[in-house]
Interface confidence: medium
């Protein structure tokens, strides 16, 4: 599923991401935009043999199990394919674990490069939340 901007903002808010660990909803929507272009089925392969999955491009080396990533830790204890569902529950729950890990949203390269320090509230402007 490819979410609309406000549709995703509403879904993320419903799942408790607004101000989770101090990160406003705009940060999460911005991250999803530049990680996956709001596409729940996005997959991207990395040079280390791991793959990033879903709307928040969660990595198989650390967070999920895709059955083929050397030394995978599967810290979210889920199959990576669960992160590709049109229901974003699994991605959100795993993202909450990631953002609580110490580096906050710096874990997402796209957030670090494209969202951090910008007017992220623009990503939820005009949305009925």
């Amino acid at each position: 599923k490819v979410f609309g901007r406000c549709e995703l903002a509403a879904a993320m808010k419903r799942h408790g991401l607004d101000n989770y660990r101090g990160y406003s909803l705009g940060n999460w929507v911005c991250a999803a935009k530049f990680e996956s272009n709001f596409n729940t089925q996005a997959t991207n392969r990395n040079t280390d043999g791991s793959t990033d999955y879903g709307i928040l491009q969660i990595n198989s080396r650390w967070w999920c199990n895709d059955g083929r990533t050397p030394g995978s830790r599967n810290l979210c204890n889920i199959p990576c394919s669960a992160l590709l569902s049109s229901d974003i529950t699994a991605s959100v729950n795993c993202a909450k674990k990631i953002v609580s890990d110490g580096n906050g949203m710096n874990a997402w390269v796209a957030w670090r490069n494209r969202c951090k320090g910008t007017d992220v509230q623009a990503w939820i402007r005009g949305c009925r939340l």
Partner: antibody, heavy 116, light 107 residues
């Protein structure tokens, strides 16, 4: 136990298309990548590409883009590879395998012969 | 693409001999190298994963070693059932690639 069962041998004419199937049993089909591999005598093994059945995500070896198309049906736990515009170069044994990085589980292979 | 070069192309041995098969990668692939055996008209069978991890059910006479670009599959005291083709495969990057194979034949 994990098993991959491929469809039977095919004899096709040049220019035609063929669809090979790979039925998986013994594991959660949607969560593992299915890989496709080509073997021709004297050419060794070639990786064609892969599909993640749960999402339909696909990756192709550049060499096979436009030649191979992958699909999967999670209701029947079956992956498919369609090969189009067949030529004699496509005559080979085609394998599906479960993609764990390594390939512990293979289908028995489908022999494709392209001949006029 | 990462090229895998296997040598020798053919190895003629007598049962009871010990042999070493080589696989060399065109660039470093850490330990992301796997070995397969294939007998005529059969699917490949995984022997060793991640350069040195013997797969369940594979006899202890098979062992693997190496890291980076140079890898070796060793068979200690070859048995008649070991004759066939041996392939290496890398999973360090895409596209996945295989070596050209080493044929192990009876002398």
């Amino acid at each position: 136990q994990v098993q991959l069962q491929e469809s039977g041998a095919e004899v096709m004419k040049p220019g035609a298309s063929v669809k090979i199937s790979c039925k998986a049993t013994g594991y959660t089909f949607s969560t593992y990548w299915i890989e496709w591999v080509k073997q021709r005598p004297g050419h060794g093994l070639e990786w064609i590409g892969e599909i993640l059945p749960g999402s339909g995500s696909t990756y192709y070896n550049e060499k096979f883009k436009g030649k191979a198309t992958f699909t999967a049906d999670t209701s029947s736990n079956t992956a498919y590879m369609q090969l189009s515009s067949l030529t004699s170069e496509d005559s080979a044994v085609y394998y599906c395998a479960r993609g764990d990085g390594w390939y512990c589980y293979w289908g028995q292979g489908t022999t494709l012969t392209v001949s006029s | 693409d990462i090229e895998l070069t296997q040598s020798p192309a053919t190895l003629s041995v007598t049962p009871g001999d010990s042999v070493s098969l080589s696989c060399r990668a065109s660039q470093s692939i850490s330990n992301n190298l796997h070995w397969y055996q294939q007998k005529s008209h059969e699917s490949p069978r995984l022997l060793i994963k991640y350069a040195s991890q013997r797969v369940s059910g594979i006899p202890s006479r098979f062992s693997g070693s190496g890291s980076g670009t140079d890898f070796t599959l060793s068979i200690n005291s070859v048995e008649t059932e070991d004759f066939g083709m041996y392939f290496c495969q890398q999973s360090n990057s895409w596209p996945r690639t295989f070596g050209g194979g080493t044929k192990l034949e009876i002398k």
